[in-house]
């Protein structure tokens, strides 16, 4: 019994005069804007996006919107076309949704914020944006009160008119409309495809948060990883950083390239490599391989408990007003607008701490 290293878990609620507001990362579920896909993009990435078959032709489809089909047929006319160099990172950056177009309004603690307060971050969803990233020398924002008026409130246009037509199932096209959101510590990168939650257009979604600080014990009392990050890419250890690190190694090993959201200096995967190797390999790693990426728990981590609720937007009463305000049709407003409210429930944090049962 002397050699049993037992621990106990202590729960505590700690009142705070202020709390650091978390980083909020959001991604449009559509990866590429239809209007930004050029002839050269279509030539190189058309098959990856299931817009072309392997003979560079538009597949025989009865599902196509006439206007979109007409535009694509024009772009897919490759007679006498000289392909130019193509880079997936540049494509994601240029054709991904722009926060300046999506963000209709932004307030933090009642003060106006703007697209400039969102930092571009690449994830498996492509070009995404983080509010309050704490990077580029910007201070981490604080909040002094709980409740909706003391957090982040944004109104977004998801731009469904820009969604790529879906003529096949690929990892780069989405059946859904909306955004994916992750609320996370500034000390860890977003891992939004695995850990994010969905927010739908036509709703105002309220996310009430509670900060939880978890303190684990290292071996032999517990199983946390006390060492600093052994990584070329991340400064501090987190399960997310470890998994991204590991997924990157796995792809480089299997495909000799990396996806655009992955760190490092391996070449970016080409559209062919995405289709033939990177997408299936990463899907396999995430879904099937239980051993390659075993990431230990860090000894200290901050997570955010969340409670979500939602109401309809627009109401019948406000539909005409919003349509006029944003110079869109009522139908457009109903299909594209969402409001997201993220706030602390109360100004305290919860500590969940493993302690040695006896010294």
């Amino acid at each position: 019994y002397y050699f049993c290293y037992h621990h106990v878990t202590k729960l505590d609620e700690v009142a705070a005069s202020q709390l650091t507001f978390p980083a909020v990362t959001l991604c449009n579920l559509n990866e590429f804007r239809f209007s930004q896909v050029s002839k050269n993009d279509l030539y190189h990435a058309g098959e990856l996006l299931a817009l072309l078959n392997n003979r560079y032709e538009i597949p025989d489809t009865q599902m196509a919107d006439e206007k979109q089909l007409e535009i694509l047929q024009d772009k897919a006319n490759f007679r006498s076309f000289k392909p130019k160099p193509f880079n997936m990172r540049e494509f994601y950056d240029r054709a991904g949704h722009d926060i300046r177009d999506m963000l209709l309004s932004c307030h933090f603690r009642g003060e106006a914020c703007s697209a400039e307060d969102f930092k571009v971050v690449f994830t498996r969803y492509g070009k995404c944006y983080t509010f309050n990233s704490g990077q580029d020398g910007r201070p981490r924002l604080k909040t002094m009160k709980g409740g909706t008026g003391n957090g982040l409130e944004i109104m977004l246009d998801i731009q469904q008119d820009e969604y790529l037509p879906v003529w096949g199932e690929t990892d780069e096209t989405s059946f859904e409309a909306g955004i994916k959101v992750q609320i996370h510590s500034q000390d860890e990168p977003p891992f939004i495809d695995q850990l994010g939650f969905g927010v739908a257009p036509g709703f105002q979604t309220f996310v009430s948060c509670q900060e939880q600080r978890l303190i684990y014990l290292p071996s032999p009392w517990g199983t946390c990883n006390a060492v600093t990050m052994d990584s070329d890419f991340f400064d501090s250890y987190s399960i997310t950083a470890c998994r991204i690190d590991c997924e990157t190694r796995y792809l480089v090993e299997n495909c000799n390239c990396r996806m655009v959201h992955m760190p490092g200096d391996a070449p970016y995967c080409t559209p062919e490599q995405y289709k033939e190797c990177a997408d299936p390999a990463l899907d396999f790693l995430v879904e099937k391989d239980q051993e390659y990426c075993v990431c230990e728990m860090p000894c200290n981590l901050t997570r955010y408990g969340k409670e979500l609720s939602m109401v309809k937007i627009p109401s019948k009463a406000s539909a005409k007003y919003l349509a006029k305000k944003f110079n869109k049709s009522e139908q457009y407003i109903g299909e594209n607008i969402l409001v997201l409210d993220i706030f602390f429930e109360v100004l305290n944090y919860e500590t969940i701490e493993q302690k040695k049962a006896y010294e």
Partner: antibody
């Protein structure tokens, strides 16, 4: 080039034992699960056994459970299949394969004949 | 264990024909299905992985589709070299299982 080279087949009497080996090259062997697949003369393909990259987890088809043991030596980049209590119905060509998002490559196939 | 049912067992066709082989899983295997071609005395050759991905070097007349429990392998225009036995395999979960095979022969 990613390659698998199997060896160790032959003729053995019913109730006897045999150990198959599969030497891997061209990839980080310890990162990948591996499997053995067999094919009896004139019959279809049958998965026999699988092992995780570290060797911690092993899996078997019901037809060989308790008689066959899969193992690996990551320092030697080699996969093994220890076959005990062999039966006539174990007569087959045995293939090793690298598991991943696609099972590629496969070894060349080793003939095992169980006959008195 | 997941059962894989392949049909037909034998298929007679002519050069130039379009042929389809189907594979049905007894429970959902997502898209973790592969198709192999095998000729007598040879190791199986991978054609399609993850239900619809064409293996490098395999002619584009081969294509795969499906997800969940229903899958198909299509050869758009049969060539003399395509007469062989074809197997589907699920690699969604242990025990991994193969279909019983489809022998494609000259009509």
């Amino acid at each position: 080039e990613v390659q698998l080279l199997a060896s160790g087949g032959g003729l053995v009497q019913p109730g006897g034992s045999l150990r198959l080996s599969c030497a891997a090259s061209g990839f980080t062997f310890s990162s990948f699960a591996m499997s053995w697949v067999r094919q009896a003369p004139g019959k279809g393909l049958e998965w026999v056994s699988g092992i995780s990259g570290s060797g911690v987890s092993t899996y078997y088809a019901d037809s060989v459970k308790g008689r066959f043991t899969i193992s690996r030596d990551n320092s030697k980049n080699t996969l093994y299949l220890q076959m005990n209590s062999l039966r006539a119905e174990d007569t087959a060509a045995y293939y090793c394969a690298k598991e991943a998002y696609k099972w590629q490559p496969w070894g060349q196939g080793i003939r095992v004949t169980v006959s008195s | 264990d997941i059962q894989m049912t392949q049909s037909p067992s034998t298929l007679s066709a002519s050069v130039g024909d379009r042929v389809t082989i189907t594979c049905r899983a007894s429970q959902s295997i997502s898209s973790w299905l592969a198709w192999y071609q095998q000729k007598p005395g040879k190791a199986p050759k991978l054609l399609i992985y993850k239900a619809s991905n064409l293996e490098s070097g395999v002619p584009s007349r081969f294509s795969g589709s499906g997800s969940g429990t229903e899958f198909t392998l299509t050869i758009s225009s049969l060539q003399p070299d395509d007469f062989a036995t074809y197997y589907c395999q699920q690699y969604n979960s242990y025990s991994y299982t193969f279909g019983q095979g489809t022998k494609l022969e000259i009509k």
